[in-house]
């Protein structure tokens, strides 16, 4: 009788190929050499191993690399990445953006898992900052990525990376995050002309101070109400009726529909009734 730990006669794997998918778990354990697996990792992802079989392959790699996998193995993990724990990933040193992309591809379409969050954290820490290429990659896979970072983490984003940010990447950011991002965006886009500048800076304005809003009001930007409603209340309150009228342009009529909501409500209460009446919207201060 074949001992369970011994590879049955004729089943020793000379290479990683499709025939292995028909092996039972213990056969994979007994018949696949870990070093062979490591050198032929590029083949593993092309073979439709089941979730259970991947457990065995992971176990073999863990035994071969107890201190963490080398990047040559990591970049070819493919579906095997789904089996990794955050603890496993913390042992890795991932420096190549191509490796990061390959692993994110496996998780595509799913929420950001703890494994992915750990991988990204390791990668960004290894690079020292969130550069444009990395940010481009991460927001392509996870539009909400930027807003998942703390204000402290966002402070390491260089202004040059802001060019990679799309409006939808900021949808879930809170005011504290926009406070950090806005000055970087202002710096990044400073050489653009008025209308182009406004298009780029618009989604960051939730972090803008009063003086910048006053400056924008002088540029005929026609800010929409959705953007206005995301502005910091403390930044909006000092604006005069004339400044708000210039800032919103034809959209000023939308204030009526928002008069009970912040920051419009609080701003209205700060204005003189005579000034509000000049808008002709029936706003009551």
């Amino acid at each position: 009788e074949v001992e369970k730990t011994a590879c049955p006669s004729g089943k020793k794997a000379p290479e990683i190929d499709e025939s292995l998918i028909f092996y039972k778990k213990w056969e994979l354990e007994a018949c696949v050499d870990a070093a062979l697996l490591a050198t032929q990792m590029d083949r593993v992802n092309a073979i439709p191993f089941t979730y259970e079989q991947l457990d065995v392959l992971k176990h073999k790699l863990d035994e071969l690399y107890p201190q963490g996998y080398p990047e040559s193995v990591i970049q070819h993990l493919g579906y095997l990445f789904l089996k990794m724990s955050p603890e496993d990933i913390r042992k890795w040193n991932v420096t190549s953006l191509e490796t990061l992309k390959a692993l994110l591809e496996v998780n595509k379409g799913h929420e950001m898992s703890p494994q992915v969050a750990t991988l990204i954290d390791r990668f960004v820490k290894g690079r020292g900052q969130l550069d444009k290429d990395t940010l481009d990659t991460l927001t392509a896979f996870y539009p909400g990525y930027l807003c998942s970072l703390s204000p402290e983490e966002l402070s390491s984003v260089p202004p040059s990376s802001i060019w990679a940010v799309r409006p939808q990447d900021l949808d879930t950011c809170d005011p504290r995050q926009l406070d950090v991002l806005y000055p970087k965006a202002r710096l990044a886009f400073q050489n653009m002309n008025g209308s182009e500048y406004f298009v780029k800076i618009q989604s960051f304005l939730g972090g803008a101070p009063t003086e910048d809003l006053k400056a924008l009001s002088q540029q005929n930007v026609s800010m929409d109400l959705a953007t206005f409603m995301k502005l910091r209340t403390d930044a909006v309150l000092p604006l005069t009726v004339a400044e708000v009228q210039k800032l919103l342009g034809p959209h000023v009529e939308g204030l009526k529909a928002e008069e009970r909501h912040r920051p419009v409500r609080d701003w209205i209460l700060r204005q003189r009734q005579d000034d509000l009446d000049t808008l002709g919207l029936g706003l009551q201060g």
């Epitope: 369970k4 292995l20 998918i21 028909f22 092996y23 039972k24 778990k25 213990w26 056969e27 994979l28 439709p48 089941t50 979730y51 259970e52 079989q53 579906y79 379409g109 799913h110």
Partner: antibody, heavy 118, light 107 residues
Framework: EVQLQQSGAELVKPGASVKLSCTAS????????MHWVKQRTEQGLEWIGR????????KYAPKFQGKATITADTSSNTAYLQLSSLTSEDTAVYYC???????????WGQGTSVTVSS | DIVMTQSQKFMSTSVGDRVSITCKAS??????VGWYQQKPGQSPKALIY???NRHTGVPDRFTGSGSGTDFTLTISNVQSEDLADYFC?????????FGGGTKLVIK
């Protein structure tokens, strides 16, 4: 020719247990996983679980944990399914199937009908 | 659990026609999908393994395709003996799960 011969129909009382058998011919069950699948009248197929007869390792669908027990006897080339605390919900045809490491089910038995009735 | 959805409960076809039965997985199951035929009063029979490979003895008018989440069993030149229920199965991750089945009805 590969064949999986299952035991005959069972009529059992609620609360009782039943043990179904599945004997393979023309192949050694140790070389395969042996699965059990449930099919209720006019309903789909449900995977109960499987055993690796080589070492007795089993895996069950959560729904059948505690209800089903799968065993195998390699000397008689037979896999077994025991169902406990039977209720009318357990009235169904139960199939055994053999499969390779992929988890696919390649060959099926003819099925055993279990009727739970007082 | 991974849900396998066969949206068509019944499909009507004529002898000689070509018919495609589809199955959608609730998550990526790569190519770990099998197709099974169950004729009235009989046990299921394996037709296709690993999404596109025909089992021994299965006529070549049966072909499987797909990967990830979308899978198709195509029967070209349908014969009267193909009247049956057809089920898909995912065996990428346990618990393994079957589609609800598609009954092929010959006009």
């Amino acid at each position: 020719e590969v064949q999986l011969q299952q035991s005959g129909a069972e009529l059992v009382k609620p609360g009782a247990s039943v043990k179904l058998s599945c004997t393979a011919s023309a192949f050694n069950i140790k070389d395969y996983y042996m699965h059990w699948v449930k099919q209720r009248t006019e309903q789909g197929l449900e995977w109960i679980g499987r055993i690796d007869p080589e070492d007795g390792e089993t895996k069950y669908a959560p729904k059948f944990q505690g209800k089903a027990t799968i065993t195998a006897d390699t000397s008689s080339n037979t896999a077994y399914l025991q169902l406990s605390s039977l209720t009318s919900e357990d009235t169904a045809v139960y199939y055994c199937a053999s499969g390779s490491g992929t988890g696919a089910m390649d060959y099926w038995g003819q099925g055993t009908s279990v009727t739970v009735s007082s | 659990d991974i849900v396998m959805t066969q949206s068509q409960k019944f499909m009507s076809t004529s002898v000689g026609d070509r018919v495609s039965i589809t199955c959608k997985a609730s998550q990526n199951v790569r190519t770990a999908v099998g197709w099974y035929q169950q004729k009235p009063g009989q046990s299921p029979k394996a037709l296709i393994y690993l999404a596109s490979n025909r089992h021994t003895g299965v006529p070549d008018r049966f072909t499987g395709s797909g990967s990830g989440t979308d899978f198709t069993l195509t029967i070209s030149n349908v014969q009267s003996e193909d009247l049956a229920d057809y089920f898909c199965l995912q065996h990428w991750n346990s618990p393994y799960t079957f589609g609800g089945g598609t009954k092929l009805v010959i006009k």
